[in-house]
Amino acid sequence: KKEDGESTAPTARPKVLRCKCHHHCPEDSVNNICSTDGYCFTMIEEDDSGTPVVTSGCLGLEGSDFQCRDTPIPHQRRSIECCTERNECNKDLHPTLPPLKDRDFVDGPIHHK
């Protein structure tokens, strides 16, 4: 998913990508930065009391196509967006919770920015 005005010229993805991490920082992360061969993500979830919880981190390349798609979960709301174009790109991701009682979102496209 490209932002308005963003260049369509291909950009070489860093071999090792650095991402901001919050609640999903591995043991070896420093200053809330993790490293990956895959994607950075930002995720929003709704807790039991209905409060939105925003977290972020690194996704390995293996299986990231599944992670970066909004896969359905029962009775709760969750949305995730992924990016690869530059280090710490997930600082600029702002996923929103899907509408209540609307499961249409779950089969939507993979969210890449």
Partner: antibody, heavy 124, light 107 residues
Amino acid sequence: QVQLQQPGAELVKPGASVKLSCKASGYTFISYWMHWVKQRPGQGLEWIGMIHPNSGSTNYNESFKSKATLTVDKSSSTAYMQLSSLTSEDSAVYYCARDLLIATVVVTPYFAYWGQGTILTVSS
Amino acid sequence: DIQMTQTTSSLSASLGDRVTISCRASQDISNFLNWYQQKPDGTIKFLIYYTSRLHSGVPSRFSGSGSGTDYSLTIRNLEQEDIATYFCQQGNTLPYTFGGGTKLEIK
């Protein structure tokens, strides 16, 4: 790649307790629910419960609430299940399984990566 | 608890066949139905989630369908490596529950 390592077998006496381990590697341990599943010889699969390594939050199958206790050690990326007051009914293969989806507070129901299982034998 | 029923406990088929394994839930599970393969050595693999989505690395000869309470797993062009026991699992409501399994054998 994702790996879940479990000991092959444990032999325990009736009435005792045992702590089964599941060492995770190849992913960020704290980001995914870990599930535990029981399989008695020649039988189907029973979900015991799940634990989120980051928060320590758990959900148990009522049938196992007085039998199983789930814990994690984040520093070694290891999940544990303690089974207490063991009887022959507890003799089974116990599997740990990592969920498919990254989660922080939501509960996710997809057992995507499985350990090889630990054969628990309860016998005097 | 939601009961999951796999009425066929064992099934014989020939290599190259198309095989369908069915699973029924005791109540509507809103497509939160997953399929697993257990090999004779005990190894368990995740095949299909949310009724019809293939997990990574699963051959495209596997497919899933269904809705409400009735679901099925289909294997096209059965191969020797598909000989295993297949379990369905509902993920709609805690506690998660599994079907009793369908053992697939070669004729």
